[in-house]
Interface confidence: medium
Amino acid sequence: LSTCKTIDMELVKRKRIEAIRGQILSKLRLASPPSQGEVPPGPLPEAVLALYNSTRDRVAGESAEPEPEPEADYYAKEVTRVLMVETHNEIYDKFKQSTHSIYMFFNTSELREAVPEPVLLSRAELRLLRLKLKVEQHVELYQKYSNNSWRYLSNRLLAPSDSPEWLSFDVTGVVRQWLSRGGEIEGFRLSAHCSCDSRDNTLQVDINGFTTGRRGDLATIHGMNRPFLLLMATPLERAQHLQSSRHRRALDTNYCFSSTEKNCCVRQLYIDFRKDLGWKWIHEPKGYHANFCLGPCPYIWSLDTQYSKVLALYNQHNPGASAAPCCVPQALEPLPIVYYVGRKPKVEQLSNMIVRSCKCS
Amino acid sequence: LSTCKTIDMELVKRKRIEAIRGQILSKLRLASPPSQGEVPPGPLPEAVLALYNSTRDRVAGESAEPEPEPEADYYAKEVTRVLMVETHNEIYDKFKQSTHSIYMFFNTSELREAVPEPVLLSRAELRLLRLKLKVEQHVELYQKYSNNSWRYLSNRLLAPSDSPEWLSFDVTGVVRQWLSRGGEIEGFRLSAHCSCDSRDNTLQVDINGFTTGRRGDLATIHGMNRPFLLLMATPLERAQHLQSSRHRRALDTNYCFSSTEKNCCVRQLYIDFRKDLGWKWIHEPKGYHANFCLGPCPYIWSLDTQYSKVLALYNQHNPGASAAPCCVPQALEPLPIVYYVGRKPKVEQLSNMIVRSCKCS
């Protein structure tokens, strides 16, 4: 599908710059750059700058761009499950009297048998089979923390439903904690959501494995359908590779800008709107680090060469097992700009403008 | 960087199949397929099948693979902000007496001035400047729903911090509702999280723009730092294009498998482990829809041709303004498998094995 040539870096940069010229106009749905005839003299109004800065501020709790997947995520995960401790265990006696909560306890020795080392755990899900539900119910999941205290983990709004449905809560961090330093028995609490001004909430949802009284007594369990932890982990015998083998590199600006990597990597490209595009109409910013992806992603013929060295290359050069792997952007970031339409300043956000990392895909 | 050739579809498929052979072994860190000498006869044990099925079950509330971005997301968004109504407004008088909550109201006429149609709104964030915090605080955000009732929206665990920090809550759905059918003034409540068994929580976090009494009375407001809604929307004059122009296609199985698309698209490929790879060692599944991406992503020279027709092509063929756009997987899904190591059955999950959609990147 493609033939190798010596790469003309200048041509690549020119093509990237010209593509960006079209991309920006296209994103703004402009057939040509806007006229600057009516733009008022002087600096941008303070309110416009404040607005522009708001779009640039990172805010607490904002989800950053997806991180490149760590090496461990490429490899297969062994799946096991650990069922909830049956409720004749004395641990449940302490937690019987609540109408707003049910309790689920797990034996940490069973967890450690499945996942001997916390670092091997890739994902843990608490799976509950909720029975049909006639009203909307807002529930919260807590983790048993110290003797009798509970730490909030997450919440879910359960829609009314006419049939049973599996619920899944990601509890990876909690199970990793338990594997490190957990007691003999650890647990979760599923509670009705109570707000500070309405506190008479009852847990309406029925979870398979509990009586409708919701007092923690285990009813008949249909097959394996009582609450369980679904664990995905790197098997112990496969773990030493992760430490010993060279880690899969994140092909990001940190690595690529400071290396002489010939293969797929993010390459530095700063675009100055005035100098590179001949544009004066974008008032802020003056330019930006657009960057681009470049470098080969060799196809690996595994047919006659199934030995460790070749297989190890898949992770870096062709993780998606493509017929023609290609070096493309992985993490992208938006670019806010300020420009004028007539006399009116506008702040606009352009999506996916800055290349932060690349991958072979 | 690449030269055009007639595509040999059979060669592409063969290369994809061979790449998958190496990929699976590589993900399992196997140098060659495992020996089947000790595998017990008969069907798989029921517990193993149940475990395998658990990994295949879609569960309620599980986040599906990221959807391909809708056409509207490609285009620029105009950014505006609407400040919270000042607290001498009578609406605040109804909500003064709580130590666990603060209230923030917004004028819907100002929102409608910024975003005339709900469909134009792409994102709305409630931005709050939280001051330095000395204790961890778990807060909840509510939306004013009917006369005096509040609907839970989201929560955040605020870590202690040595300096002020912007908080952002995604309230796109709520603001879209308000634009459709909101009253004259609508609002949010930020509350301490109260669990059903400990209800004496006080809102410890100070939000800039409120007195320390935290009773909703507005103190002096430092600059523009009182709570505001940051809105990102498609400008009205740009909106008709979205209805009239052909929507950006999702290059997914729904579209690609039922069309004769020559350009970049996901192509159907079922891999039968026995027939295609000569493998008997994977017991479940018998095969899977691996699929692959194929088709040109034409580079568009915009230099001499900045007119609407050419610019419209960017969205489909080169949205990332690449120097050499390439057809690559967008949404991928995992594959669980069951195989034996000696006499022991194993369930393993292989990440990113099934191609659901493609994109030019």
Epitope: - | L131, K132, K134, S163, P164, D206, T212
Partner: antibody, heavy 117, light 110 residues
């Protein structure tokens, strides 16, 4: 109440740990600070330890001081004292939940550290 | 940085008079400010916090006001016992801060 101890005459470069012992309240509910005052000078903030254990320091500290705590004590370690560190060192407790701000309403009497060769 | 500048450095006031001490922040700190009184040989004593809230057991002759960057401590009906050094303290940010306290104002009674 809070009381500082451990102040003494030390030579430059000799590490020194001051201890603040608290009674009548739990350190898991209150932020605690260390402040020093050179003879005839004003109050100089060193750092604070929050109830949850987070520590924050003045810009100039630059690793020269470390604050830590146990269930009943808050320690200030001076890693390599210089003559400029000669001062009375105060430990103080935050007002607690009566304000979300960190202000100090219970102070120890102070302990004198003299650094001299 | 959030630097606190106190003025004047010292002031003399007659018994029964009123004294005003100012504290200026280099950037806006909202109302996150406290005032302390310190007498020779003693630790500081909290007078006012959150710019205007009187601490427990403090005389109502002490009044705090201001927000943003300008703050004032006013002592009315001055008594001999008010002779001391007064410090302001910001609690807006610890980041890039050299000192959360102002330089102090010495009040002497005529």
């Amino acid at each position: 109440s809070v009381e500082e101890s451990g102040g003494r005459l030390v030579t430059p470069g000799t590490p020194l740990t001051l201890t603040c012992t608290v009674s009548g309240f739990s350190l898991s509910n209150y932020a605690m600070t260390w402040v020093r005052q050179a003879p005839g000078k004003g109050l100089e903030w060193i750092g604070v330890i929050y109830a949850g254990g987070n520590t924050y320091y003045a810009n100039w500290v630059n690793g020269r001081f470390t604050i830590s705590k146990t269930s009943t004590t808050v320690d200030l370690k001076i890693t390599s004292p210089t003559t400029e560190d000669t001062a009375t060192y105060f430990c103080a407790r935050d007002v607690g939940s009566s304000s979300s701000g960190v202000y100090f309403n219970i102070w120890g009497p102070g302990t004198l550290v003299t650094v001299s060769s | 940085a959030y630097d606190m500048t106190q003025t004047p450095a010292s002031v003399e006031v007659a018994v029964g008079g009123t004294v005003t001490i100012k504290c200026q922040a280099s950037q806006s700190i909202g109302s996150r400010l406290a005032w302390y009184q310190q007498k020779p040989g003693q630790p500081p004593k909290l007078l006012i916090y959150d710019a205007s809230t009187l601490a427990s057991g403090v005389s109502s002759r002490f009044k705090g006001s201001g927000s943003g960057t300008e703050f004032t401590l006013t002592i009315s009906g001055v008594e001999c016992a008010d002779a001391a050094t007064y410090y302001c303290q910001q609690d807006y940010s610890y980041r890039h801060v050299d000192n959360i306290f102002g330089g102090g104002t010495k009040v002497e009674i005529k």
